[in-house]
């Protein structure tokens, strides 16, 4: 029986050009985490495998850094990075747990660059 739950940072926002940490945490289970996938709906960003270590997709190699921990750091953000990100925990013996984070990448804030009257 799957008793675990995934806690995520939920909905987050960051500025264009900045960086963000995508983080999930699996709790309420003693299952062993054997692999974590970080994915968008249409592509894989990275895999952290207990035996093989980290794999970063070539599409993201220049902008993604592994960690901290099982998380992922996304750098040099663009507006196109806005969207949903999935952390997929492969565990034994429970199976697979999925969490989701919605990232909104904003143009530089009005406070910094907005018109002043």
């Amino acid at each position: 029986m799957m008793t675990g739950t995934i806690e995520t940072t939920g909905n987050i926002s960051a500025e264009k050009g900045g960086s963000i940490i995508l983080q999930c945490h699996l709790s309420s289970t003693t299952a062993q985490v054997t692999q974590v996938n970080w994915e968008q709906q249409d592509q894989l960003l990275a895999i952290c495998n207990a035996d093989l270590g980290w794999h970063i997709s070539p599409s993201f190699k220049d902008r993604v850094a592994p960690g901290p921990g099982l998380g992922l750091t996304l750098q040099s953000l663009t507006v196109n990075d806005t969207g949903e990100y999935f952390c997929i925990y492969h565990t034994y013996p429970d199976g697979t747990y999925t969490g989701r984070i919605f990232l909104e990448v904003l143009e530089s804030s009005v406070a910094e660059h907005g018109a002043r009257f």
Epitope: E39, Q41, Q43, N49
Partner: antibody, heavy 118, light 107 residues
Amino acid sequence: DVQLQESGPGLVKPSQTLSLTCTVTGYSITSDYAWNWIRQPPGKGLEWMGYISYSGSARYNPSLKSRITISRDTSMNQFSLKLNSVTAEDTATYYCARKGYPAYFAYWGQGTLVTVSS
Amino acid sequence: DIQMTQSPSSLSASVGDRVSITCKASQDVSTAVAWYQQKPGQAPRLLIYSASYRYTGVPDRFSGSGSGTDFTLTISSLQAEDVAVYYCQHHYSTPYTFGQGTKLEIK
């Protein structure tokens, strides 16, 4: 339990539009996942055609991109395939399937054979 | 697109035999590979995902291994009901592609 069921005409004339619908029961297509079309010509392998995600965004196989549209009817819990300008090479069994996380296909319809012939 | 090449295209083995089917990806897909079984007149059935994780309800005689570009589906002790066509699929990015299939028969 999640069930998917394809429906639509079994015979389409060349140059016309193939239209199929997948009815999903036991799960709302707006709740999660991506909802796919996969086809299999007689005696051949499987080809992923595209999907519409639970949020409504679509992705298509570039080999079909100019001809394919996947849409949905949330009130009926259905999603649909339209394939334009069909030829005999589009004769296949068409499956609808749910993509999981990661992107495997655990739930499939039983498939419907569409023949393109005049 | 990432191409998936399966071998052999067909295979005949005896009940109780250990059987292996291989799949080669045209680029590194890490562990993003699934395996399916398709019996005549039926939809494919998911057996393995992420290269080595057995899907719910799949008998433990089916196992998967590999990473990078080379992957294997193994049936440890072939049963008569395992006669089918087996397909690999990468789940790395769209467009998802499948191997051409391996037809498994009983001797």
